[in-house]
Structures are given as C-alpha cells and as structure tokens.
C-alpha cells in the first residue's frame, strides 16, 4: 500500500500492503486541485512542477499541467500555463496536504462508520464489526459475509475472520482437506480456479487459530471453524487459488 | 519502455496488449483465465465499452496481432473512485468473453497479499508495447526494464511530484531517469519476484514525460485495490 | 468463405411473437460480436442491439429495449432475435451483420418481417 | 444520442462524373487513443444487404474499387466517388461507433 510504516531504524522504512481497508481506499482530492490538472498529450514542458501524464494514447483539451497518460499523443503547454500552475500549485500543495491528511484519517477510522464500524457498499450502512462475517447478512447485498476469507502473506496463508474477536486468524491444518480449499477460493472470487492447499509450518508465531468442526455435518465451511488456541498439526493452511507469478525464467529456476 | 530490452518468450506472460480499432492503446495483467488487470483511464469514455477491446495473450510482436487471434471483452469495470484529473485510484478490469488456456506463454500473475512486506527500493519490472523514447511510436516489440520502487515520501518531495503521489499510487523507477515506461504502457504491470514468485505490486499510470530526472513513472498502488478486484471477481455471475 | 445465412421472409399476426434467425459460418462463431439492424420500407437502418455469442452479453438500442430480446445457440452458430408484441409497425427487413473492430464487415440477406392479420 | 445527419438526400449524375456526399456527426467521432475516426461508410444496392465500403473514416475495405474514397475526421466526413459507374446506382449510409451505433439517414444515387 506504500504508505511507510514504522520499522527498525537500521532497514528503513518499508511498503507495506496491509490490505482489506474499507473502501473506497483514498478520496478524491479537494475540489480546489483537479482544475489544476488535466489529461493531456505525451509532451514535456519544463516546469518545476510534473506534466501530468498518463501513458496511454490521448490527446486533450487546454491544459493547466500537461497530464500525460502513458499512452500515446501530442500537444505542448505554453509558459502561461506554467504561470497559472505555479500560484494554484503553491496554493494547492498546502489544501492538498491538509485534505489528503484528513481524507486519510477518515477513511482508516472506518470511512463514515464510528469506530471501526463497517459500510456496506450496496448501501452505505454501518454494521458493528461484531456482526461481520457471523454468518447472519446484515448489508443488502451480503457483502459483510462474503469477504471472510483472505490470503496472507507471500505465502498464501488463509486467514479467516473471527467476529467474535474482530481479528483474523490463520486456519489450522488439522483435518483441512482439498474441497474446503475450493470453497475457500470460490468466496474469494476464483470461481473456477484452484491450484494447491497444503499445510505449512506456520512461523508467524500465532497462538490463535481457527480450526474445523469436523462433527458440524454438511453446513457452510465458515459455519465449521471455531476459534481455538492450539493446532496440533503446528502447520496452517497455504491456499493457492491459481498457478500464478511463474513464468519461463522462474520454471526453470524451481526445477 | 524506455530503457528496456526485448522481452524473451514466455518471459512475462501475464502480459496483454489491449487494441482498439486494430492499434495497441493500452497494456493489461492477467491474474486469472477471465480477467484482465489495466489503468482505468485506459477505459474512460467512449472507450468504456466493452465491444470496442480486443485482448492478445501470449503474441510479443504488435504485427502478430490480429482480431481472430485476439480475446473480446465481456465487461469493462472501472474504479468506481477513479479520478480522470488527479489520477487517483487509476485501475479497471476486464473481464473476457472466453476464459484464456494458459501455456508458457500465457499464464497469470499473482495478486499481492495483505501482510506482504516490500522493500523501500525493492527491484521491480515493468513491460510493455509503448513508446521507447519520449513522443515515440508504439513499439513492435514487447519490452521490459528493471526499475526501483520509490519511497511515496520521497516521490512526494517538492523537487520530485510535490504531493501529487496519493496512497493509491506508487512510484518507480530512477531519479536519474533514463529507464521508465511510458505511452503506450498505461495499464500494464510494475512485477516483483518475491520467494520466486511474481507479484503485481502497479499497474502503469502516469508520468511527467518519459525516463526524465526527477519524474519517475507513477503506478497504480495495487496492493491498494486487492480487496475491491477479489470483489467485482466475486459479484460476476 | 463468411456467411450469414437468414431466411427470406416471415409472416406473423399482430400481438404475436416470433423469432428471426441468422446462422453463421466460415468463421469462428464465438469470436465475433454479432448486431441486429431494422430497415423498414424505404427508410434508413436503424441499430437495435448487440451479442457476443461466447458469454450472451447484450447491449441493445433504447428504442428497442422492450421489444427485442437477442440470444445464440453456440452449437449450432446460430444468433436468434425474438421480437415481441408484434404491430404493423415492425413490419421490416432485418438484418444480422457480424463486428468486426468496430465495423459491420458482413452482413445476412435480411429478413422480411411482415405483421398483418 | 450521437445524431448523424447526410447531406444530400439524394443526387442524379451521369457516369463517368465526380461525386461528394457529407456526413455530419453531432459531436466528434476521432478516437484520441488510436487517432482513428469511429465512422464507416456503407453501399445498399437496391434489394440487397448493405456492403461495407469505407470504416475509420478513410480506410477502403479490401476489394472496394478505389475510386471510392473517406476523408473527414472529428464531425465532418466526406465520400468521395470520383469517376460514377452506373453498378455504384444505391444509397449510402454513414455510421457512427463512438458511442453505440447510429446510421445517418441516407444518400441516394441516382445515375442519369
């Protein structure tokens, strides 16, 4: 996610994905900017401030920054412009930066919701984090049941939501098999995709896991997992949806 | 690309060339047989039809491309907070009319996972068809270069992007310039290879120029947008 | 060679439906969105709406929303447009054509539609 | 809606002589990305299907004579045939792919 969290002084700071915000993740910027912006052709006027480019095949309309798309075209800011831009510019930063600081906190406090409240997106209501992914829907259109389900970590750890303790906890290989992978990865959006699902010595230093009622009967897969502090197996679940990330050099490299 | 070198066969194979009207217009990723990762700015109007994009897969060279070989879009899904002027949240999917068979050629990246920690100037790599000078042509071939990631704090800094980076972007490439991508290249990956695996950590947005000192190419933050992709895959069908 | 092959004429009474055809061949039937265009007597075409035979997505003409409803048969590369609730009106030829980029680069016979009692 | 309107309706030459019809479009069809115009041009022979001449404005279909010819580009487009054979008797039809899919009303060529 790029945002430099704290970390040991000796490495620096690092980007870290902490995934799973409430959306939508960042806010338009203030009204004031935008005007200062507009999509624009693939040319370069010297500026100390950036064309604003996107690298696709564009051509536009009178520009304030020149924004390139990385796409094709061609036009050229003239030095009024770069007037223009150097007093809204000077005067954007400072709205910017105090919008995009608030904009920040508003929505890593639970976009509109009170504390860590959740919003459904299909209609903007809050719903208390103890009701997300308890099995009963409470958004219109079930999304608070429907994202339960997570992969961690650059090795594919599954992770499910407990709502009783409003965390996520890595699933316990005791009696996991094959089908509950499938299911897994169909309610995280693969539907026809499953690769692999092994268990992998889990050295995350977890003392929380969710482990399966074996004895629960043919209900939902989330319906099986409780909440336990041990897993006999010490190894959990690595759940890989699809044979992704391998390409010719790296085939190679594993045989 | 700029600064790139030719891409090897199967070298990057979630790599798509996205035609309108017989031309290359935007790259794409793909993470799985029916759904294409590219920048939502490749899609703004009129463009947001489905009908008008035609997907190759597993082709390096532009003039190999052709509409029988190609895939047709189905669905074309925008971020619904994708802002044409800032930039912000720039990322859209595709989603295919028929799923694609992977082979070495052909096959899909992996989506980034939350908890995954990336150096401030983890080694990364960006491909496509776009021009390989700055106001250059479309380039027949599929390039890549390596770049750096730069730290959001420092592409931020007045002499570099002066606060135009949201946390929905990332930056990469060389403050000395010289290697970056650039028209042409919008929608395609910015890849890392971690435990041998290849994530896609951006997809490419925009940039002051191409490969200039102090403008480094900006990427959509795609670790940013995990759960919104899982959820348009999830809500299909 | 392309061909799109659509029966000559139709004869049906007002209120009634029915269903025209178009079957394709010479090419890979999947791959090409395929449209459906109304000419009445004299006049100009008119665009009524779009299918990829692959997944059934449509898109359709406003005007003809409640009207037409267009789907396929893969197996036997065969695009289908029912019109409904049908009035003098809707007399017409219709057409099929096949998409190519953005273009119509072949076109059915067309369809003589005749609604009378 | 995009509306696309044709100018003339209708026209009567004689064989051998230089023909213009204009197709105007109510906003610009050029497709910034690909600088290619979304407007084709096609033939209706009397009691037949229409036939694609001209698409992105000045592109000829292959095995279309080349004395038809596209030109025009954001909202005003030309065809041009410069030498009228009496097999080119029909109506010409512009259209639009920018947004959708609209027809123009229609050129008639008569031949003298």
């Known amino acids: 996610m790029a945002l430099n969290s704290g970390s040991p002084p000796a490495i620096g700071p690092y980007y870290e994905n902490h995934g799973y915000q409430p959306e939508n993740p960042y806010p338009a910027q203030p009204t004031v900017v935008p005007t200062v912006y507009e999509v624009h052709p693939a040319q370069y006027y010297p500026s100390p401030v950036p064309q604003y480019a996107p690298r696709v095949l564009t051509q536009a309309s009178n520009p304030v920054v020149c924004t390139q798309p990385k796409s094709p075209s061609g036009t050229v800011c003239t030095s009024k412009t770069k007037k223009a831009l150097c007093i809204t510019l000077t005067l954007g930063t400072f709205l910017v930066g105090a919008a995009l600081a608030a904009g920040l906190l508003w929505k890593f406090m639970g976009s509109k919701c009170s504390n860590s409240g959740i919003e459904c997106d299909s209609s903007g209501t809050c719903i208390n984090p103890s009701n997300w992914c308890d099995g009963v829907s409470h958004c219109p259109g079930g999304e608070d049941e429907n994202r339960c389900v997570r992969l961690y970590g650059p090795n594919f750890i599954l992770q499910v939501y407990s709502s009783q303790r409003k965390s996520w906890h890595p699933v316990c290989q005791d009696d996991w098999n094959e089908a509950y992978g499938r299911a897994a990865c169909r309610d995280m959006g693969y539907k026809n995709n499953f690769y692999s699902s092994q268990g992998i010595v889990d050295d995350s230093g977890s003392t929380s896991f969710m482990k399966l009622n074996t004895s629960a009967g043919n209900v939902d897969i989330y319906k099986k997992l409780y909440h336990s502090d041990a897993c006999s197996s010490k190894a959990v679940v690595s759940l890989r949806c699809i044979a992704c990330g391998v390409n010719l050099n790296s085939s190679r490299q594993s045989r | 690309i700029v600064g790139g070198e030719s891409a090897l066969p199967g070298a990057w194979p979630w790599q798509v060339s996205l035609h309108v009207q017989n031309v290359h217009v935007c790259g794409g990723s793909i993470i799985t047989p029916e759904w294409i990762v590219t920048a939502a700015h490749c899609v703004e109007k009129p463009l947001n039809n489905p009908w008008h994009w035609t997907a190759f897969a597993g082709i390096l060279r532009q003039s190999f491309m052709f509409y029988g070989a190609g895939y047709q879009v189905e669905k074309v899904i925008s971020h619904p907070n994708y802002d044409s002027k800032t930039k912000n949240n720039d990322i859209a999917l595709m989603k295919l009319q028929k799923p694609l068979t992977f082979n070495d050629l052909v096959k899909p990246v992996c989506l980034p996972n939350p908890g995954m920690m990336l150096q401030p100037e983890q080694l990364c790599w960006i491909s496509g068809w776009g021009a390989t000078e700055e106001k250059g042509k479309t380039s027949e071939v599929l390039n890549a270069a390596k770049v750096l990631l730069i730290e959001t704090q420092r592409c931020n800094s007045r002499y570099v992007y002066d606060n135009l980076i949201t946390p929905a972007m990332i930056c990469a490439g060389f403050l000395q310039g010289n290697v970056d991508s650039c028209q042409g290249d919008s929608g395609g990956p910015l890849v890392t290879s971690k435990n041998n695996i290849w994530w896609l950590i951006g997809d490419t947005s925009w940039g002051s120029g191409c490969a200039k000192a102090y403008r480094p190419g900006v990427y959509g933050n795609v670790m940013v947008f995990t759960d919104w992709i899982y959820r348009q895959m999830r809500a299909d069908g | 060679q392309v061909q799109l092959q659509q029966p000559g004429a139709e004869l049906v009474k007002p209120g009634a439906s029915v269903k025209l055809s178009c079957k394709a061949s010479?090419?890979?039937?999947?791959?090409?969105?395929m449209h459906w265009v109304r000419q009445r007597p004299g006049q100009g075409l008119e665009w009524i709406g779009i299918?990829?035979?692959?997944?059934?997505?449509?898109n359709y003409n406003e005007k003809f929303k409640s009207k037409a409803s267009l789907t396929v048969d893969k197996s036997s590369s065969t695009a289908y447009m029912q019109l409904s609730s049908l009035t003098s009106e809707d007399s017409a030829v219709y057409y099929c054509?096949?998409?190519?980029?953005?273009?119509?680069?072949?076109w059915g016979q067309g369809t003589t539609l005749t609604v009378s009692s | 809606d995009i509306v696309m309107s044709q100018s003339p309706s209708s026209l009567a030459v004689s064989a051998g002589e230089k023909v213009t019809m204009s197709c105007k479009s109510s906003?610009?069809?050029?497709?910034?990305?690909?600088?290619?115009?979304?407007l084709a041009w096609y033939q209706q022979k009397p009691g037949q299907s229409p036939k694609l001449l001209i698409y992105?404005?000045?592109t000829r279909e292959s095995g279309v004579p080349d004395r038809f010819t596209g030109s025009g580009s954001g909202t005003d487009f030309t065809l041009t045939i410069s030498s009228v054979q009496a097999e080119d008797l029909a109506v010409y039809y512009c259209k639009q792919s920018y947004n959708l899919y609209t027809f123009g009303g229609g050129t008639k060529l008569e031949i003298k």
């Open positions: 906003q610009s069809l050029l497709n910034s990305r690909t600088r290619k115009n979304f």
């Open positions: 054509a096949r998409l190519l980029w953005d273009y119509f680069d072949y």
């Open positions: 992105w404005a000045s």
């Open positions: 299918i990829h035979p692959n997944s059934g997505t449509t």
């Open positions: 010479g090419y890979s039937f999947t791959t090409y969105w």
